[in-house]
């Protein structure tokens, strides 16, 4: 099926017209405009940018563009009382202090309001104590420390390297281990690619560069003070003690020059193995404490940041659909940045801007999409996906009834090697078909399709001749739409050839060095990768909004459900004796998956044959497709994570960035051998299998013939 039908206008206004209107030069110009000053959430600069975008989207031709504001909890360093870490001697004298700011990049020395590196939402405090090096502070790292190495982190300050998992999970793990403070640092092993110079001479992280970021564990709650409801004028706010997801111990990030000074003195145990060693010239000893002559020295943190309820602004643009105005396809990305936002988010915001301009051009020529397209410039994503979540909370009733799809548009690039797509299985065929029609921007693939270069460089681990498409996790603004509301979602960007470092980000991520020049000089001088990402994101939106039959293939869900059921069964089968003892069976789940597969197959056959000229039947079939994702939502949510309601996918409990399949069962099985009450633990596994089997069966039935 093609989206090339026109809606009330001449046939020339098709996908090709939309794609041809997208220009690399415009994306470049918009990126420059968006990155000259910082746009930190809650600041006047970011409010002014919201108004500029509102004005320009109106000029581009959208039907309406409104600001949606909320008053949410944000976090800022104290301007007169800076955060830092020191080494103190036995007399309490500070013999070393970490730097208070990053050296500004060339050309930006006189820019004001560059927020110094900090961990957003860290509580205030000045803990002092011995240091323990905890590698990436993952669940498995703490298991190794506590269970194998017999190291107790209680009352210690831990130092963890950034990478592998979301920083909020690191902090949560440290808290659970009893730590009284956390120091986060960027190790060159993770943030300095061999053979590349550091900024400004290359795209690597200099020793004084530091990654900012929030350290919340919101689990999809949005504003910590108003979970489940919008932070509007009449909101009831929780007290700070009842706020969702706030860390309880001070946390602060540093660069690798400062980290060297802390780590070079470490004593105690050698690292357990080479996977705990980074690239600094230090022994990577775990501690606790400093070695030999330095054993009387301690580490002291000085954290004075404050949490403040602050107004944020989303920009919401509407392009009304001509045929189904009550069906919404949403393209959204955030606008707020930690500093200049050269990549995150403005490389994405510039692409959204150009997509809006292209749609606006078509609209001015008399075209309208079949369905309504909503464009969003979200605020306060960096502070916990707050803008998108508050807007979705405010509009949840409309979205759950009318939401067709959400396409995310944060950073367009995290490298320039190949495409990276994470999406619902419903969109697999859409992405495949679209990328087959787009030209590859890659060197060596001139005249070849994007599909071909993508498949060659990032092959699917399961299906030969197909590209890898990953599960949606979180850490971005699609979270509320997919994980809470069950709206089919997807994201696309250009990425690096760095599979082992999947969740560490690019070297200059969230640092002051993430500038326009970083992109223009080192990542994408011709803006050809940005243009390709604009074509993918825009093309997906176009097809979702304009195709007569929604471009969702439910058979692809059947395939992955079987794969996920096999995977979780094999995890459970590592405990054959317990499965026998507690009568644990996956029969109900496999039966439900089998039923889903058969019903999806029959639905797809009907989809080929039905009378598309009958608007009632067309709408009925489209609604079955639209509501399929919704059918995977459990209104009760996952255990202890009420805003993660999707039964098939959730962010991993150990890494917010990663997606986990059948998360309820997975979490029930995780570390089950250590549970004090095995009978209760295996009972929960059985309950989760029941919930999953019921949900898959119920979802299958939504695809059955209606009568």
């Amino acid at each position: 099926k093609s989206s090339n039908e026109a809606t009330n206008i001449t046939p020339k206004h098709n996908m090709k017209a939309f794609l041809d209107e997208l220009k690399a030069e415009n994306i470049k110009k918009f990126l420059y405009n968006f990155t000259q000053i910082p746009h930190l959430a809650g600041t006047e600069q970011n409010f002014q940018l919201a108004k500029q975008i509102q004005s320009q989207w109106k000029e581009f031709g959208l039907d309406s563009v409104e600001l949606a504001h909320y008053d949410v909890l944000l976090s800022y360093p104290n301007k007169t009382h800076p955060n830092y870490i020191s080494i103190i001697n036995e007399d309490g004298n500070e013999i070393f202090n970490t730097s208070l700011f990053e050296p500004p990049p060339p050309g930006y020395e006189n820019v004001s309001d560059i927020v110094p590196p900090f961990s957003a939402f860290s509580p205030q405090g000045m803990p002092e104590g011995d240091l323990v090096y905890v590698n990436y502070a993952r669940t498995e790292d703490f298991f190794k420390l506590e269970r194998d190495m017999k190291i107790n982190c209680s009352g210690k300050i831990v130092i963890a390297r950034y990478g592998k998992v979301f920083r909020g999970n690191k902090v949560k793990n440290a808290q659970l281990a009893g730590a009284k403070g956390v120091i986060l640092y960027s190790d060159p092993a993770d943030y300095f690619a061999p053979g590349v110079k550091s900024y400004p001479d290359g795209w690597n992280l200099p020793g004084g560069g530091v990654q900012r970021g929030n350290i919340l564990n919101l689990n999809g709650a949005g504003d910590p003070l108003t979970p489940g409801y919008p932070a509007n004028e009449y909101a009831y706010r929780r007290g700070i003690a009842e706020a969702v997801g706030l860390p309880s111990i001070p946390v602060h990030p540093i660069g690798y020059y400062d980290a060297q000074k802390l780590l070079e003195k470490m004593g105690g145990s050698a690292p357990p193995d080479s996977s705990w060693r980074g690239s600094l010239k230090v022994p990577y000893n775990v501690g606790p404490g400093f070695t030999g002559n330095f054993s009387t020295q301690k580490v002291k943190m000085h954290i004075h940041s404050t949490n403040e309820v602050t107004r944020i602004y989303n920009v919401i643009g509407t392009l009304r659909g001509a045929v189904e105005p009550d069906r919404y396809v949403i393209l959204g990305g955030h606008r707020d940045s930690w500093v200049f936002g050269g990549i995150d988010p403005q490389s994405g915001a510039a692409v959204v801007h150009e997509i809006v301009r292209s749609f606006g051009t078509l609209k001015k020529e008399g075209w309208r999409p079949r369905r309504t397209i909503l464009f969003a410039s979200w605020d306060a994503e960096e502070f916990g996906l707050l803008g998108s979540t508050e807007w979705a909370e405010e509009n949840s009733r409309l979205l759950q009834e009318r939401g067709v799809a959400y396409i995310n548009a944060d950073s367009s690039i995290e490298g320039n090697y190949t495409l990276r797509v994470d999406c619902t299985p419903l969109m697999y065929s859409l992405v495949h078909n679209l990328t087959k029609e787009l030209k590859s921007p890659d060197e060596g693939f001139e005249g070849k399709s994007l599909y071909e270069s993508w498949t060659k460089k990032s092959p699917s681990p399961e299906f030969s001749g197909m590209p890898r498409i990953s599960k949606l996790g979180s850490g971005n603004d699609f979270e509320v739409f997919f994980q809470r509301l069950g709206i089919a979602s997807g994201r696309a960007r250009y990425t690096k050839n760095w599979e082992t470092n999947k969740f560490s980000g690019y070297p200059l991520y969230h640092s002051v060095y993430e500038t326009y020049e970083l992109v223009e000089k080192f990542y994408d001088p011709m803006f050809k990768y940005h243009l390709t990402v604009a074509q993918v994101r825009g093309g997906m939106v176009f097809e979702l909004a304009n195709s007569i039959v929604l471009p969702f293939d439910c058979r692809d869900y059947a395939v992955v459900l079987r794969k996920y059921a096999d995977k979780i069964y094999s995890i459970s089968m590592k405990h054959p004796q317990e499965m026998k003892t507690y009568s644990v069976s996956f029969d109900s789940l496999f039966s439900a998956v089998k039923n889903f597969t058969e019903i999806a197959s029959k639905f797809s056959e009907r989809l080929q044959d039905f009378d598309k000229s009958n608007p009632i039947v067309l709408r009925m079939m489209n609604d079955q497709l639209m509501f399929l994702e919704r059918a995977f939502i459990d209104p009760l949510g996952l255990p202890d994570r009420p805003f993660y309601r999707h039964v098939i996918y959730a962010p991993s409990s150990h890494n917010k960035y990663a997606g986990e399949s059948f998360p309820g069962i997975y979490d029930a099985l995780f570390d089950i051998e250590s549970k004090v009450d095995p009978s209760k633990a295996w009972g929960e596994v059985k309950r989760q299998i029941y919930v999953a089997a019921f949900t898959v069966q119920a979802a299958a039935e939504t695809l059955s013939e209606v009568a």
Epitope: E140, F143, K144, R147, D148, M149, K150, G267, G268, S269, A270, P272, D273, S274, S275, P283, N285, G289, T291, G292, S295, K574, E673
Partner: antibody, heavy 116, light 107 residues
């Protein structure tokens, strides 16, 4: 119940290689490092190296100068230690031991005799 | 490599005696020292880690102390089942190294 079960005794000629296996059960194999420690008759314990079964990465005691290779098969929950260019002084009991730095759990040992 | 030197190499004591074994590291290892007991024909068994922490199930008559370079294993009241060879091990630096062992016998 947790167990490390090693392969049986071996007699080898000088210059040959030996591969000793260590099958783990009763825990998640990939969660814990596996070390190899040997003990020549009447001698001290000697750490040879370790493997992180999750990543398959190994660290070695440089004393063995590339003669030792530690591998694993996660599907079989088994670690292997191969020692090449055997000499008479390699005659020892070879142990696998679970842990990181500390060895709370040991295999039963495998006697390797190197004799012409 | 860090050398671990135990003394004495062997000792003989009576049931009920207080027995002390020492271990000296060639360079500072903080408190990253463990002690193992190996009975004849058996595998080594972890007794003490972090110089002074008893492993699960180890009788309270076994205790450890020390930091830096000098470490001690003490058996407060020797029992017949304590006949074994005792090894110290440092885990502060790679390669991990053991002492040469102290053989303990009953008089």
């Amino acid at each position: 119940e947790f167990q490390l079960v090693q392969s049986g005794a071996e007699v080898k000629k000088p210059g040959a290689s030996v591969k000793v296996s260590c099958k783990a059960s009763g825990y998640t194999f990939t969660d814990h490092n596996m070390n190899w420690v040997r003990q020549a008759p009447g001698q001290r314990l000697e750490w040879m190296g370790l493997i992180n079964p999750n990543y398959g990465t190994a660290d070695y005691n440089q004393k063995f100068k590339g003669r030792v290779t530690i591998t694993r098969d996660t599907s079989a929950s088994t670690a292997y230690m191969e020692l090449s260019s055997l000499r008479s002084e390699d005659t020892a009991v070879y142990y696998c031991a679970r842990g990181s730095s500390l060895f709370a759990y040991w295999g039963q040992g495998t006697l390797v005799t190197v004799s012409s | 490599d860090i050398q671990m030197t135990q003394s004495p190499s062997s000792l003989s004591a009576s049931v009920g005696d207080r027995v002390t074994i020492t271990c000296k590291a060639s360079q500072g290892v903080d408190t990253a020292v463990a002690w193992y007991q190996q009975k004849p024909g058996k595998v080594p068994k972890l007794l003490i880690y972090w110089a002074s922490t008893r492993h699960t199930g180890v009788p309270s008559r076994f205790s450890g102390s020390g930091s830096g370079t000098d470490f001690t294993l003490t058996i407060s009241s020797l029992q017949p089942e304590d006949v074994a060879t005792y090894y110290c091990q440092q885990y502060s630096r790679y390669p991990l190294t053991f002492g040469q062992g102290t053989k303990l016998e009953i008089k």
